[in-house]
């Protein structure tokens, strides 16, 4: 399944702790693109290997 990404709705602007929220249109779900040095589904963990 090819997902299309857009900015998340305003309801989810704070969803990603250390990253950018992207909206998976077809799945109706949020996803996070983490800033450098962070990992996790919501970019909530510092990457100790970075």
């Amino acid at each position: 399944v090819v997902s299309h990404f857009n900015d998340c709705p305003d309801s989810h602007t704070q969803f990603c702790f250390h990253g950018t929220c992207r909206f998976l249109v077809q799945e109706d779900k949020p996803a996070c693109v983490c800033h450098s040095g962070y990992v996790g589904a919501r970019c909530e963990h510092a990457d100790l290997l970075a």
Partner: antibody
Framework: VQLQESGPGLVKPSQSLSLTCTVT?????????WNWIRQFPGNKLEWMGY???????SYNPSLKSRISITRDTSKNQFFLQLNSVTTEDTATYYC??????????WGQGTLVTVSA | DIQMTQTTSSLSASLGDRLTISCRAS??????LNWYQQKPDGTVKLLIY???RLHSGVPSRFSGSGSGTDYSLTISNLEQEDIATYFC?????????FGGGTKLEIK
């Protein structure tokens, strides 16, 4: 996925309204948000709140002091409780599966009348 | 809360017609606009999500468009089974809110 609402069709003013949504074909702990929506006489729709697959809840601020949504994962059911009802709570109540922006699948609805 | 307005509460059309139902939001909802169909028996189905995307199983005669605060649903070749009430819903901001509905009737 199929959703089916059930519960009393008549509730007295000041009492609590309790409804059950039974979900088949999908586990409510797997994903998605499990919502309650109501439709007043005259067609106006109102989102009431949801319980997510993880168990977290979100409620419409207009109802926050009166509403509770819970679940029984062993029965794959979720529940609506609305306290201190008045005749203004007379509506058709729907349960629906949603994501973060839309309601993809709805139950058939159940009419609840609040009357003495 | 974001107010959703469907200015036309009822619409009369003939089978085979092309018709458009409008919906306006009280503020920019960034294309997070969905359309639902409610049949006379109360059954509700999602038709279109994110302004213009067809939900699975929905006939291609349904289409959606719009941006910012103004959105529309178009039925290109009206069929008997399309007789229903149509609701818009914004999904950008909690609490999610609905338009008042547009009831479609046959001339």
């Amino acid at each position: 996925v199929q959703l089916q609402e059930s519960g009393p069709g008549l509730v007295k003013p000041s009492q609590s309204l309790s409804l059950t949504c039974t979900v088949t074909g999908y586990s409510i702990t797997s994903d998605y948000a499990w919502n309650w929506i109501r439709q007043f006489p005259g067609n106006k729709l109102e989102w009431m709140g949801y319980i997510s697959y993880s168990g977290s809840t979100s409620y419409n601020p207009s109802l926050k002091s009166r509403i509770s949504i819970t679940r029984d994962t062993s029965k794959n059911q979720f529940f609506l409780q609305l306290n201190s009802v008045t005749t203004e709570d007379t509506a058709t109540y729907y349960c629906a599966r949603g994501g973060i922006t839309r309601f993809a699948y709805w139950g058939q609805g159940t009419l609840v009348t609040v009357s003495a | 809360d974001i107010q959703m307005t469907q200015t036309t509460s009822s619409l009369s059309a003939s089978l085979g017609d092309r018709l458009t139902i409008s919906c306006r939001a009280s503020q920019d909802i960034r294309n997070y606009l969905n359309w639902y169909q409610q049949k006379p028996d109360g059954t509700v189905k999602l038709l279109i999500y994110y302004t213009s995307r067809l939900h699975s199983g929905v006939p291609s005669r349904f289409s959606g468009s719009g941006s910012g605060t103004d959105y529309s649903l178009t039925i290109s070749n009206l069929e008997q089974e399309d007789i229903a009430t149509y609701f818009c819903q914004q999904g950008n901001t909690l609490p999610w809110t609905f338009g008042g509905g547009t009831k479609l009737e046959i001339k």
